[in-house]
Each structure stands twice: as structure tokens, then as C-alpha cells.
């Protein structure tokens, strides 16, 4: 029962996490204009992974996509890649984990297969969460670097345009969504790996019980027939899967001199 709960909770947490990663990737507010020096600007700038936006005091919001691919900073491309890899792995993990859920019965799938799939999906969720956390952290590092580097007349913005007044950018809402979502996906993955250990059936040794019928000397050993209901314990010897998931080395981010924001 505890295993089913752990697996189910892991799935739900990962599902929320991956939804959050998708939301963060699509959000426009990865970096927002720092209003410390000018809290009453009539023009508010913010940028995402795919486009930059300007919200005017009039209520009008104008967004422009980054229609260039080669002209974008390598770090931004790396963040995009990390987030997309995280989403893809997470989506595959969700698909696998649906079939691995103990409460869902698919044909005559054995517990060993479910345990294997649970572990696979768990590892996928862990890597997915790490990708999201790494992507958001790389972007945050880029923002911090550029925040202190930003001076008047420097080349800034996605297209490398010259600006004549200092515009600094700070952390946007998407970064916090990404960090939380990545963490949830990671936690969900760990829970799936823990559930995997409980799913893998251990070797069950049954003691033979002899029933002596009058006039017969036949010993009946239970366990000789497979349970047809699908709920009984399977007494076949199964390989016990180790739930300790190996994760890839953490992506180390170095301060970049890319004038992104």
C-alpha cells in the first residue's frame, strides 16, 4: 500500500513539476527590467527565451520574437536546449510511469516489468529536473553577470542593439517557476526510484505442509498453481532491482561575457 502511495505521489509531483517546466520555458518573464533606479517608468521591458516584450503605461504590450538563430548568445541557446531536453525527458518519463503505476493493470504485465519501468521513469524525472534547474541557473548566472557589467552605451539585448541609456535586467518570475518545477520533478523522480524498490518482489520461500489423507500418502504443496485473479503474490524468483539511481554529472555554469541582457 505504501509503495503504491509513494509511486502515485511521485507521479503526481513529477507531473506538476513537468507542467511547471513547460510553463517556465514558455513564459516571457525570464528577465525583467530592474526598476531600482527608475520605479516610475512608463515603459517596462521583459524578456523570455523566445521573445522580448515591452509593456507600455497605456496598457499596450508589444512582443517581438528572436527571429535569428545564429545571432543569439550561445548561453541562451544552451538554456533553451536544457529546458527542451528537460521537457522531452519528462514527457517520456510521464508516459513510461503511467504504464508503471501499480494501480493500473495492463494485460499480464509482471511486477518486475513495472519495477523496471518505475525506475526508468524515476531516472528520467531526475535528469529532467536537473536539466531544468541547470537551465534556469545558467540563465540566472548570465543575468547576474550582465547586471554588474551593464553600463551606458554597451551592446545589450537579444539582437545586440546599442542602447543610449542603461537598462538593467533582474530575475523574472519564470526563473522561480523553473527552479520550483525542476525541484518538484527531481523529488518526484526520487520518489519513483524509492517506489521501485518496494515494487520489485523478493524471493518468497513457502514451507511445505503435508496433508495426510487416509489411505493415501500424497503430499500437497501449495504454490503449484498460478493465481488467476491477478491479485495474488507471484512466487517466481525475481531479480531485485536496486533503486539507487545514478545521475549525470552536474552541469557547471561559468560566468559568461555574453551581452545578453
Amino acid at each position: 500500500m505504501a509503495v503504491t502511495a509513494c509511486q502515485g505521489l511521485g507521479f503526481v509531483v513529477s507531473l506538476i513539476g513537468i507542467a511547471g517546466i513547460i510553463a517556465a520555458t514558455c513564459m516571457d518573464q525570464w528577465s525583467t527590467q530592474d526598476l531600482y533606479n527608475n520605479p516610475v517608468t512608463a515603459v517596462f521591458n521583459y524578456q523570455g527565451l523566445w521573445r522580448s516584450c515591452v509593456r507600455e503605461s497605456s496598457g499596450f504590450t508589444e512582443c517581438r520574437g528572436y527571429f535569428t538563430l545564429l545571432g543569439l548568445p550561445a548561453m541562451l541557446q544552451a538554456v533553451r536546449a536544457l529546458m527542451i531536453v528537460g521537457i522531452v525527458l519528462g514527457a517520456i518519463g510521464l508516459l513510461v510511469s503511467i504504464f508503471a503505476l501499480k494501480c493500473i493493470r495492463i494485460g499480464s504485465m509482471e511486477d518486475s516489468a513495472k519495477a523496471n519501468m518505475t525506475l526508468t521513469s524515476g531516472i528520467m524525472f531526475i535528469v529532467s529536473g536537473l536539466c531544468a534547474i541547470a537551465g534556469v541557473s545558467v540563465f540566472a548566472n548570465m543575468l547576474v553577470t550582465n547586471f554588474w557589467m551593464s553600463t551606458a552605451n554597451m551592446y545589450t539585448g537579444m539582437g545586440g542593439m546599442v542602447q543610449t541609456v542603461q537598462t538593467r535586467y533582474t530575475f523574472g518570475a519564470a526563473l522561480f517557476v523553473g527552479w520550483v518545477a525542476g525541484g518538484l520533478t527531481l523529488i518526484g523522480g526520487v520518489m519513483m526510484c524509492i517506489a521501485c524498490r518496494g515494487l520489485a518482489p523478493e524471493e518468497t520461500n513457502y514451507k511445505a505442509v503435508s496433508y495426510h489423507a487416509s489411505g493415501h500418502s500424497v503430499a500437497y504443496k501449495p504454490g503449484g498453481f498460478k493465481a488467476s485473479t491477478g491479485f495474488g503474490s507471484n512466487t517466481k524468483n525475481k531479480k531485485i532491482y536496486d533503486g539507487g539511481a545514478r545521475t549525470e554529472d552536474e552541469v557547471q555554469s561559468y560566468p559568461s561575457k555574453h551581452d545578453y541582457v
Epitope: 516610475v40 524578456q47 497605456s58 499596450f60 542593439m161 541609456v165
Partner: antibody, heavy 120, light 113 residues
Framework: EVMLVESGGGLVQPGGSLRLSCAAS????????MSWVRQTPEKRLEWVAT????????YYLDSVKGRFTISRDNAKNTLYLQMNSLRAEDTALYYC?????????????WGQGTLITVSS | DIVMTQSPLSLPVTPGEPASISCKSS????????????LAWYLQKPGQPPKLLIY???TRESGVPDRFTGSGFGTDFTLKISRVEAEDVGVYYC?????????FGAGTKLEIK
């Protein structure tokens, strides 16, 4: 046709209060950011206050902050300017103006104005 | 606050002749996010409220004759009238639309010679 009609102006003593109204018609009032702009007797234009469409954000000229309050009633299509602790330097022709949606924050429509004279 | 400085304060022009008004801001009105300049030009005719002529430093408001042209970048802006007509008489104001308070220039009075 877009129309902005101001009312509530008049003669008031220093330290007194007055409430200006601006009745809007011919456009979806709640969508637009609205402003009050005044023109001094020397013919200088001075922005006074701005309120965004939903009414959530307001901006004021430093010299009127704490004394003037801009508000709006989207159901009645009306903009207000509550003026307290009036001073002689507040004497001006007060215009109600609409901030154009795609006009880069420029004021695309103005009312005819209402005159306020602060004098003892 | 951003200070808007207009010149000249008075501009006598012969009908049919060109006219040029300058406006300088103490801070840049250029926004790097969308590569736009947040400056507007208004004309106030006697006994009337100001009327929007140009926004975004160079975009003509609908209904404004094409003899009016706005130009400039950052801190220096110009309003040009290719051929002045009698109906163009009035006071021209430039306005900062970038940062609150939304300051106006002192105005340039265009008169017919």
C-alpha cells in the same frame, strides 16, 4: 466619436477641496489609461496624474502627491480627480486626456478642459 | 525629472515656407526593448485643447497631413513642416512619454509673417 467632457471646476480658496469629473464616451473606457493634464496661466502644459485601465496603478506629479487622488468608475465611464489642500499654484485649466493604446503612451484625445482658480 | 527644452520659443514663418522646431531631452527617450523613441508632438490652436500630431518620435497620428514630419533619436528631436499653411498656426509642444512625470516642453509659438 470619442468625447471627453470635464466638469467640477470653479473658484476655491487655498486649502480647499474640489472634485473634477470627466465623462467619457465613444470608446471602451475600461481598456484605456487616462490622465489629467493642466495648463497654467503662463500656457505651460503640466502632466498631473495617470490611472491605468483597471485602476490598479496610479502615477502622480510629485507636487500633487498626497493631495490629489485620481480614480475611475469604469461602470459609469467616468474619470475623477479629487483635489485637497489646494494651493495658488494649482490654478490652471485642467484637461482630461486618453492615452492611446498604440500611440507609445501619447495622449491621443483631450477634453475641452475645466478651469480651477485657487484664490482667497 | 526629464527636462524638455524646445527652441525656438517663437517662430515667424511665411506661408509655403518650411519650418523646423527642435526639442532636446535631459535623458534619453529611447527604449532598447523595442527600439522606439518615446516622444510626442502636439499642436494647440487658440482656444482649443492640444492635438496629437506625432508619436514615437516619427509616427504621424491618423488624419495629420504628411507635411508634418518627426525625426530624432535618444535626446535630440525635430518637428519639420515642409510647407507652412495658415491653419498650422498655434503652439507646438513636445512631450516625454518614456518616464513619469510625463514632462512637456515650454512650447514653440508658430506665427504667420
Amino acid at each position: 466619436e470619442v468625447m471627453l467632457v470635464e466638469s467640477g471646476g470653479g473658484l476655491v480658496q487655498p486649502g480647499g477641496s474640489l472634485r473634477l469629473s470627466c465623462a467619457a464616451s465613444g470608446f471602451t473606457f475600461s481598456t484605456y489609461t487616462m490622465s489629467w493634464v493642466r495648463q497654467t496661466p503662463e500656457k505651460r502644459l503640466e502632466w498631473v496624474a495617470t490611472i491605468v485601465g483597471g485602476g490598479g496603478y496610479t502615477y502622480y506629479l510629485d507636487s500633487v502627491k498626497g493631495r490629489f487622488t485620481i480614480s475611475r468608475d469604469n461602470a459609469k465611464n467616468t474619470l475623477y480627480l479629487q483635489m485637497n489642500s489646494l494651493r495658488a499654484e494649482d490654478t490652471a485649466l485642467y484637461y482630461c486626456a486618453r492615452m492611446g493604446l498604440t500611440q507609445r503612451n501619447a495622449l491621443d484625445y483631450w477634453g475641452q478642459g475645466t478651469l480651477i482658480t485657487v484664490s482667497s | 525629472d526629464i527636462v524638455m527644452t524646445q527652441s525656438p520659443l517663437s517662430l515667424p514663418v511665411t506661408p509655403g515656407e518650411p519650418a523646423s522646431i527642435s526639442c532636446k531631452s535631459s535623458q534619453s527617450l529611447f527604449n532598447s526593448g523595442n527600439q522606439k523613441n518615446y516622444l510626442a508632438w502636439y499642436l494647440q490652436k487658440p482656444g482649443q485643447p492640444p492635438k496629437l500630431l506625432i508619436y514615437g518620435a516619427s509616427t504621424r497620428e491618423s488624419g495629420v497631413p504628411d507635411r508634418f514630419t518627426g525625426s530624432g533619436f535618444g535626446t535630440d528631436f525635430t518637428l519639420k513642416i515642409s510647407r507652412v499653411e495658415a491653419e498650422d498656426v498655434g503652439v507646438y509642444y513636445c512631450q516625454n512619454d518614456h518616464t513619469y512625470p510625463l514632462t512637456f516642453g515650454a512650447g514653440t509659438k508658430l506665427e504667420i509673417k
